[in-house]
C-alpha cells in the first residue's frame, strides 16, 4: 500500500515538475528590466529563451522572436539545450512511469518489469530535474554578471553633456517557476527510486522448511523455482508478502508462502 | 469613432478643489493608458497625470505630486482628475488624451479651461 | 525630468519650401529592447487641440501626409516637411514618451513669409 501511494506520489509530484519545467521554458519573462533605482520609463522590457518583448505604458506589447541561431550567446543556447533535455527525458519518464503504476494493470506484467521501469522513469525524472535546474541556475549567473557589469557603466556620458541609462535585467518569474518545476521533478524522481525499491522481487527472509512425506523427502528451500516445481517456464523469483493487509490482486497474483507442491 | 469630452473646469480661489471629468467612447477604455495634459497661456504643454492600462500604475510630474489624482471608472467610461490646494500656475486648459502606439497621445478632447486666480 | 529643447522656436517659410526643425533630449529616448526611439512629433492649429504626427520617432500616423518625416535616434531628432502647404502652419511639439514625467518641447512655430 504504502508502496503504491509512493509510486503515484511521486508520478502526480513529477508530472506538476514537467508541466512546470515546460510552462518556464515557454515563459518570456526569464529576465525582467529591473525597476529599482532607475528612472520610471512608460516602456518595460523582458525577455524569455525564445523572444524579448517590449510593453509599453499604453498597453501595446510587442514581442520579437530570435530569429538567428549563431548570433545567440552560446550561455543562451547551452541553457535552451539543457530545458529541453529536462522536457524530453521527463516526457519519456512519463510515459514510462505511466506503465509501471501498480495500480494499472498491463497484461501479465511482473513486478519486477514495474519495477525496473519505475526505477527507469526515477532516473529520468531526477537527471530531468537536475537539467532544468542547472538551466535555470547558468541563466540566473548569466543575468547577475550582465546587472553588475552594467551597474558598473550604468551611466555612460556621451559628450559630457547627454547621458544613455542603460536598460538592467533582474531575475523573471519563468525562474522562479523553472527552480521549483525542476525540484518538483526531483523530489518525484527520487520517490519513484524509493518506490522501486519496495517493488523489487527480493530473497524471502523465513528459514528453510523440510516436510516428510510419505516415501521421500522434499526440502523446501528459499530461491528460485524450478521447471520441476509445476510452474512451468517461469523460472523467475516472484516477490512473496509475508505480513500485513494483502489487496485482493495481491492475494490473487502472487503465490503466498504456502502455495508448495 | 474615438471621443473624449472634458467638463468640470471653471475659475477657482487658490487653495481651492475642482474635478475634472473626462466621458470616452469609440474605443476600450479599460484597456487603455490615459493621460492629462495641461497647455499654460504661454501655450507650453505639460503632462500632468497619466494612469496605465489595467490601472496597475499612476504618474505625477513633482509639480503636481501630492496634489492632483488620477481615476477612472470604467462602468461609466470616465477619466478624473481631482485637483486639490490649486495655485495660480495651475491656469491652464486641461485635455484629457488616449495613449496609443508608442505611447503617443492619439486622440485628444477639445479640453476644459481651469483659471486659478482671487 | 527629461529637457526636451527644440529649436528654432519659429520659423518663416514660403510655400513648397522643404522645412526641417530639431528636437534635443536630455538622456537618450532609444529602448534597446525593442530598438525603437520614444519620441512623438505633435501639430498644434490655432483653436485646436494637438494632433499626433509622428511616433516611434519615425512611424507617420495614419491619415498624416507623407511630406512629413521624422527621423534621429537617441538624443537627436529631426522633423521635416518636403514641400510645407498653407494648411500646415501650426505649432509643432516633440515629446518624450519614454521617461516619466512625459514632457514637451516647448515648440517650433510654423509661419508663412
Known amino acids: 500500500m504504502a508502496v503504491t501511494a509512493c509510486q503515484g506520489l511521486g508520478f502526480v509530484v513529477s508530472l506538476i515538475g514537467i508541466a512546470g519545467i515546460i510552462a518556464a521554458t515557454c515563459m518570456d519573462q526569464w529576465s525582467t528590466q529591473d525597476l529599482y533605482n532607475n528612472p520610471v520609463t512608460a516602456v518595460f522590457n523582458y525577455q524569455g529563451l525564445w523572444r524579448s518583448c517590449v510593453r509599453e505604458s499604453s498597453g501595446f506589447t510587442e514581442c520579437r522572436g530570435y530569429f538567428t541561431l549563431l548570433g545567440l550567446p552560446a550561455m543562451l543556447q547551452a541553457v535552451r539545450a539543457l530545458m529541453i533535455v529536462g522536457i524530453v527525458l521527463g516526457a519519456i519518464g512519463l510515459l514510462v512511469s505511466i506503465f509501471a503504476l501498480k495500480c494499472i494493470r498491463i497484461g501479465s506484467m511482473e513486478d519486477s518489469a514495474k519495477a525496473n521501469m519505475t526505477l527507469t522513469s526515477g532516473i529520468m525524472f531526477i537527471v530531468s530535474g537536475l537539467c532544468a535546474i542547472a538551466g535555470v541556475s547558468v541563466f540566473a549567473n548569466m543575468l547577475v554578471t550582465n546587472f553588475w557589469m552594467s551597474t558598473a557603466n550604468m551611466y555612460t556620458g556621451m559628450g559630457g553633456m547627454v547621458q544613455t541609462v542603460q536598460t538592467r535585467y533582474t531575475f523573471g518569474a519563468a525562474l522562479f517557476v523553472g527552480w521549483v518545476a525542476g525540484g518538483l521533478t526531483l523530489i518525484g524522481g527520487v520517490m519513484m527510486c524509493i518506490a522501486c525499491r519496495g517493488l523489487a522481487p527480493e530473497e524471502t527472509n523465513y528459514k528453510a522448511v523440510s516436510y516428510h512425506a510419505s516415501g521421500h523427502s522434499v526440502a523446501y528451500k528459499p530461491g528460485g523455482f524450478k521447471a520441476s516445481t509445476g510452474f512451468g517456464s517461469n523460472t523467475k523469483n516472484k516477490k512473496i508478502y509475508d505480513g500485513g493487509a494483502r489487496t485482493e490482486d495481491e492475494v490473487q497474483s502472487y503465490p503466498s508462502k504456502h502455495d508448495y507442491v | 469613432e474615438v471621443m473624449l469630452v472634458e467638463s468640470g473646469g471653471g475659475l477657482v480661489k487658490p487653495g481651492g478643489s475642482l474635478k475634472l471629468s473626462c466621458a470616452a467612447s469609440g474605443f476600450s477604455f479599460s484597456n487603455s493608458a490615459m493621460s492629462w495634459v495641461r497647455q499654460t497661456p504661454e501655450k507650453r504643454l505639460e503632462g500632468v497625470a497619466t494612469?496605465?492600462?489595467?490601472?496597475?500604475?499612476?504618474y505625477y510630474p513633482d509639480s503636481v505630486k501630492g496634489r492632483f489624482t488620477i481615476s477612472r471608472d470604467t462602468a461609466k467610461n470616465s477619466l478624473y482628475l481631482q485637483m486639490s490646494s490649486l495655485r495660480s500656475e495651475d491656469t491652464a486648459v486641461y485635455y484629457c488624451?488616449?495613449?496609443?502606439?508608442?505611447?503617443?497621445?492619439?486622440?485628444w478632447g477639445q479640453g476644459t479651461s481651469v483659471t486659478v486666480s482671487s | 525630468d527629461i529637457v526636451m529643447t527644440q529649436s528654432p522656436s519659429s520659423l518663416t517659410v514660403t510655400a513648397g519650401e522643404k522645412v526641417t526643425m530639431s528636437c534635443k533630449s536630455s538622456?537618450?529616448?532609444?529602448?534597446?529592447?525593442?530598438?525603437?526611439?520614444?519620441l512623438t512629433w505633435y501639430q498644434q492649429k490655432p483653436g485646436q487641440p494637438p494632433k499626433l504626427l509622428i511616433y516611434w520617432s519615425s512611424t507617420r500616423e495614419s491619415g498624416v501626409p507623407d511630406r512629413f518625416t521624422g527621423s534621429g535616434s537617441g538624443t537627436d531628432f529631426t522633423l521635416t516637411i518636403s514641400s510645407v502647404q498653407a494648411e500646415d502652419l501650426a505649432v509643432y511639439y516633440c515629446?518624450?514618451?519614454?521617461?516619466?514625467?512625459?514632457?514637451f518641447g516647448a515648440g517650433t512655430k510654423l509661419e508663412l513669409k
Open positions: 538622456q537618450s529616448l532609444l529602448n534597446s529592447g525593442n530598438q525603437k526611439n520614444y
Open positions: 488624451t488616449r495613449q496609443g502606439y508608442g505611447n503617443a497621445m492619439d486622440y
Open positions: 494612469i496605465s492600462s489595467g490601472d496597475s500604475y499612476t
Open positions: 515629446q518624450n514618451d519614454y521617461y516619466y514625467p512625459l514632457t
